[in-house]
């Protein structure tokens, strides 16, 4: 991979340990927590990042679930099990043998159960809605300029192919970014929308995952765009399976 050779660091993931012990003395970086080798030319998977984060825990967060099939990360942080490719394993369990099924972004999509719970496949999150509220400004941002700036950001900072940014909606002060990526659309080497959304979420919170890069400085025609709250909704290719008790709660 293309980790910086001079000082051997991982530009796309500061939660790594790097050393020149790769083939031919090349810089090789491993994620904290899992020890898995990461490709520093692209985003690290959310599963490995969460695992690394749990090796230096911070406060969990809670979000609100808006509708029947849209999932929000209500459960906050947990120490996930990742497969050899760094993806979430379909079934996650905690230390007390409580288990649940997750989607490809690691968000719980079933009721919690015991060790007998089966999660047959990792269900893909194919549609992510990032809902932002920006701080008050003198006037509304120009919609086209705002739209282009956010699309540029996802291309340049997160390396997300432009075809996966489906839409940018704006009704001051609310901005919605829609990311869509079906299993059939995602080619080898494409950044996953779940990973891009996670990096963006951390950037917005001032917790950038990038090494040696400034924090996110969003500007629209030079005007700062300051986000005061973020909600992220996840839609899966197969609807989640929660009991009626939860749905009516």
């Amino acid at each position: 991979h293309t980790a910086a050779q001079d000082n051997c660091t991982c530009p796309t993931n500061k939660m790594t340990v790097c050393s020149p012990d790769g083939p031919g003395g090349r810089c090789q970086c491993r994620a904290l927590g899992s020890g898995m080798a990461v490709d520093c030319s692209t985003l690290t998977s959310k599963c490995l990042l969460l695992k690394a984060r749990m090796s230096a825990p911070k406060n969990a967060r809670t979000l609100v679930r808006p509708s029947e099939h849209a999932l929000v990360d209500n459960d906050g942080l947990y120490d996930p099990d990742c497969d050899p490719e760094g993806r979430f394993k379909a079934r996650q369990c905690n230390q007390t043998s409580v288990c649940w099924c997750v989607n490809s972004v690691g968000v719980r999509r079933t009721d919690k159960g015991d060790l007998s719970l089966r999660c047959d496949e990792l269900v893909r999150t194919h549609h992510i809605l990032i809902d932002l509220r920006h701080r008050p400004t003198a006037g509304a941002f120009n919609h086209s300029d705002l739209d282009a700036e956010l699309r540029r950001l996802f291309r340049e900072r997160y390396r997300l192919h432009p075809k996966f940014v489906a839409a940018v909606h704006y009704e001051q002060p609310t901005i919605q970014i829609e990311l869509r990526q079906n299993t059939s659309q995602k080619a080898a080497g494409d950044v996953d929308i779940g990973d891009a959304a996670y990096y963006f979420e951390r950037d917005i919170k001032g917790e950038s995952l990038f090494q040696g890069r400034g924090g996110l400085d969003l500007r629209v025609r030079g005007e700062p765009l300051q986000v005061e709250r973020t909600l992220i909704y996840y839609l899966d290719e197969i609807p989640p399976k929660f009991s009626m008790k939860r749905l009516t709660a």
Epitope: S144, P162, K163, D217
Partner: antibody, heavy 117, light 106 residues
């Protein structure tokens, strides 16, 4: 094979408009971005703006805002850049270039626009 | 706008020489891109993400740098390398190019 084929040279009078076309092939047109860059004779490269072909989202640089219009015809996989109120300093080669996770990965061959009275 | 200043503006060198072109940004950028342009032709992507060679680019080309200072190096000049080289950023709108470095045969 990715190709961007631009329209032929144009000679225009000051105050007139010019519309340069860029026909794309070898890739899914609406998945990408087309940027426009110009180069005055003997000078460097100057970015004009870009259009997201799937959504029609456009960004123009401040310098060209109000004078430039970028459009795309998805049925023919062709992008267009129209520049109005032409002046002599607009004489340049105009390039279209495809954007993806790179700003410009493939370029058209260029279209020479000459503005002369 | 982020200004990019290339140095030198022109350079005379011989086949086999090692050549270095620098690009200085007026404020920090994430990555630098480098293009090669030959007379009468469109620019060609040479290096992306500061140091990664574009497809088909010979290994004698290399890129490095971070923040505001970036470098393009040609380890051993070949006859086909005589051209104009441009750096470019897209860390913020508008995308900007350096003024170019013309590499001529001595």
């Amino acid at each position: 094979e990715v190709q961007l084929v631009q329209s032929g040279p144009e000679v225009k009078k000051p105050g007139a408009s010019v519309k340069v076309s860029c026909k794309a092939s070898g890739f899914t047109f609406t998945d990408y971005v087309i940027g426009w860059v110009r180069q005055a004779p003997g000078q460097g490269l100057e970015w004009i703006g870009e259009i997201y072909l799937g959504s029609g989202t456009i960004y123009y640089t401040e310098k060209f805002k109000g004078r430039v219009t970028m459009t795309a015809d998805t049925s023919t996989s062709t992008a267009y850049m129209e520049l109005s109120s032409l002046r002599s300093e607009d004489t340049a080669v105009y390039y279209c270039a495809r954007g993806s996770i790179f700003p410009f990965d493939y370029w058209g061959q260029g279209t020479l626009v000459t503005v002369s009275s | 706008d982020i200004q990019l200043t290339q140095s030198p503006s022109s350079l005379s060198a011989s086949v086999g020489d090692r050549v270095t072109i620098t690009c200085s940004a007026s404020s920090s950028v994430s990555y630098m891109y480098w293009y090669q342009q030959k007379p009468g032709k469109a620019p060609k992507l040479l290096i992306y993400d500061t140091s990664t060679l574009a497809s088909g680019v010979p290994s004698r080309f290399s890129g490095s740098g971070s923040g505001t200072d970036f470098t393009l190096t040609i380890s051993s000049l070949q006859p086909e390398d005589f051209a104009t080289y441009y750096c470019q950023q897209w860390s913020s709108y508008p995308y900007t190019f350096g003024q170019g470095t013309k590499l001529e045969i001595k």
